[in-house]
């Protein structure tokens, strides 16, 4: 007899989710010597415990604490790059600028990047059919709560100058409802963080506007200043050239504005 199953509005758990998490954990711990001590089977146990058998609209940050504890990692606090709606370029940047880190360059971020997961109340099954959508169903779903938890911790760890990459092609360059706008901005610690430097990435080749004057950027500046953190902003007019110059800073064309 087929059991009635809750239909959610979002896509179901990524296929082979446990295997993917385990495989990513093994790969990460092999590449990063400082995380070699991590037992990936225990990491998966903590991950499964956070959401399986629990109602997927009733997940709390507390559910993820065992996983957070196992994934505790020290990254240089002055080398943190946050991003909003421009993940690919942020990741391309840290792949070149190896001493800077996005959340997805940490173990926990790497494990969950681009994955979806949820369980069902009172069964030890993973729901591969559907998972709650943040807008249409509920915000306290396993994926959203995970990213809120790790993003908060990542922002809390930051110090000195924190950089954030923002997408200048979007109508809201700074979006208060993004993870950056709703979580990370509010968890930067003023006693540790001196400056938030925004890099606004231009989309069009002929776009020479100063997007640092955009009203949403001014709104970000206001929020940050009220938190006693300095704010600075730079336009990145040519992201392709920007990446190229990160790779080869001595290139003669890299002295001009990018």
């Amino acid at each position: 007899v087929p059991r009635w199953r809750q239909q959610w509005s979002g896509p179901g758990t990524t296929k082979r989710f446990p295997e993917t998490v385990l495989a990513r954990c093994v790969k990460y711990t092999e590449i990063h010597p400082e995380m070699r001590h991590v037992d990936c089977q225990s990491v998966w146990d903590a991950f499964k415990g956070a959401f399986i058998s629990k109602h997927p609209c009733n997940i709390t940050e507390e559910d993820y604490q065992p996983l957070m504890k196992l994934g505790t990692q020290t990254v240089p606090c002055n080398k943190i790059l946050l991003w909003s709606r421009i993940k690919d370029l942020a990741h391309q940047f840290t792949q070149v600028q190896r001493d800077m880190f996005t959340l997805e360059d940490t173990l926990l971020g790497y494990l969950a990047d681009d994955l979806t997961w949820c369980g069902e109340f009172n069964t030890s099954k993973i729901n591969y059919q559907s998972c709650p959508d943040w807008r249409k169903d509920c915000s306290n779903n396993p994926v959203s709560v995970f990213w809120k938890t790790v993003s908060r911790r990542f922002a809390e760890a930051a110090c000195d100058v924190v950089h954030v990459m923002l997408n200048g092609s979007r109508s809201k360059i700074f979006d208060k409802n993004s993870t950056f706008g709703s979580v990370e901005v509010h968890n930067l610690q003023p006693e540790k963080v001196q400056t938030l430097e925004a890099w606004v990435i231009h989309g069009g080749r002929e776009d020479s506007r100063d997007l640092c004057q955009d009203p949403t950027i001014k709104e970000l500046e206001s929020i940050i200043s009220k938190r006693n953190i300095q704010f600075s902003c730079k336009n990145i007019y040519r992201p392709d050239k920007f990446l190229q110059c990160v790779k080869n800073p001595e290139d003669s064309s890299c002295t001009s504005e990018i």
Partner: antibody, heavy 120, light 107 residues
Framework: QVQLVQSGAEVKKPGSSVKVSCKAS????????FSWVRQAPGQGLEWMGR????????NSAQKFQGRVTITADKSTSTAYMELSSLRSEDTAVYYC?????????????WGQGTLVTVSS | DIQMTQSPSSLSASVGDRVTITCRAS??????LAWYQQKPEKAPKSLIY???SLQSGVPSRFSGSGSGTDFTLTISSLQPEDFATYYC?????????FGQGTKVEIK
């Protein structure tokens, strides 16, 4: 029909090593994990460690770390448990047991057990 | 490590009796609990997983309940083939740990 067939009984001297095998048939070997559980005469069950063949990773109980090596050979669908520096207290029946990689369920299939006797 | 404590360690019962075995975890394990039956000279056999789910092929007289730290295995009407030793086991975290066992004997 899933079957886990273990190697035969062993008699070993203190200080030596023993390697027990567990050959799986009737299922996709790489879709599962294999644990080793031992039972001393008249005693309860004691988990030793677990291997995930598809990833080639294993973990073990702290009590056995440094003495136990758990491996798997995907080509022959066989899991292995090697215990070194044997002492008389290691005399036990050693079982292999299967569970799913995600560890969402119990040990659903067990080998028949291998008696290892450690005696001088 | 999570300690699993079973009680009683042994009990005597008659065919047809209702038998209850309890298992307590030293810390919360949600519903990550399995029950096994073991007969002399045989490998253990899975009865219950996820605290209350019946393993395929196991008679419905076996049932499990509980979550967190306190769990129960119930045999509603003991049959001759049920005389054996029963173990609980947590699979919430490593190392996996078993209870010390409950031997069910014929009265």
């Amino acid at each position: 029909q899933v079957q886990l067939v273990q190697s035969g009984a062993e008699v070993k001297k203190p200080g030596s090593s023993v390697k027990v095998s567990c050959k799986a048939s009737g299922g996709t070997f790489s879709s599962y994990a294999f644990s080793w559980v031992r039972q001393a005469p008249g005693q309860g069950l004691e988990w030793m460690g677990r291997v995930i063949p598809f990833l080639g990773i294993a973990n073990s109980a702290q009590k056995f770390q440094g003495r136990v090596t758990i491996t798997a050979d995907k080509s022959t669908s066989t899991a292995y448990m090697e215990l070194s520096s044997l002492r008389s207290e290691d005399t036990a029946v050693y079982y292999c047991a299967r569970d799913d990689i995600a560890a969402l369920g119990p040990f659903d299939y067990w080998g028949q057990g291998t008696l290892v006797t450690v005696s001088s | 490590d999570i300690q699993m404590t079973q009680s009683p360690s042994s009990l005597s019962a008659s065919v047809g009796d209702r038998v209850t075995i309890t298992c307590r975890a030293s810390q919360g394990i949600s519903s990550w609990l399995a029950w096994y039956q073991q007969k002399p000279e045989k490998a253990p056999k899975s009865l219950i997983y996820a605290a209350s789910s019946l393993q395929s092929g196991v008679p419905s007289r076996f049932s499990g309940s509980g979550s967190g730290t306190d769990f129960t295995l119930t045999i509603s009407s003991l049959q001759p083939e049920d005389f054996a030793t029963y173990y609980c086991q947590q699979y919430n975290s490593y190392p996996r740990t078993f209870g010390q066992g409950t031997k069910v004997e014929i009265k």
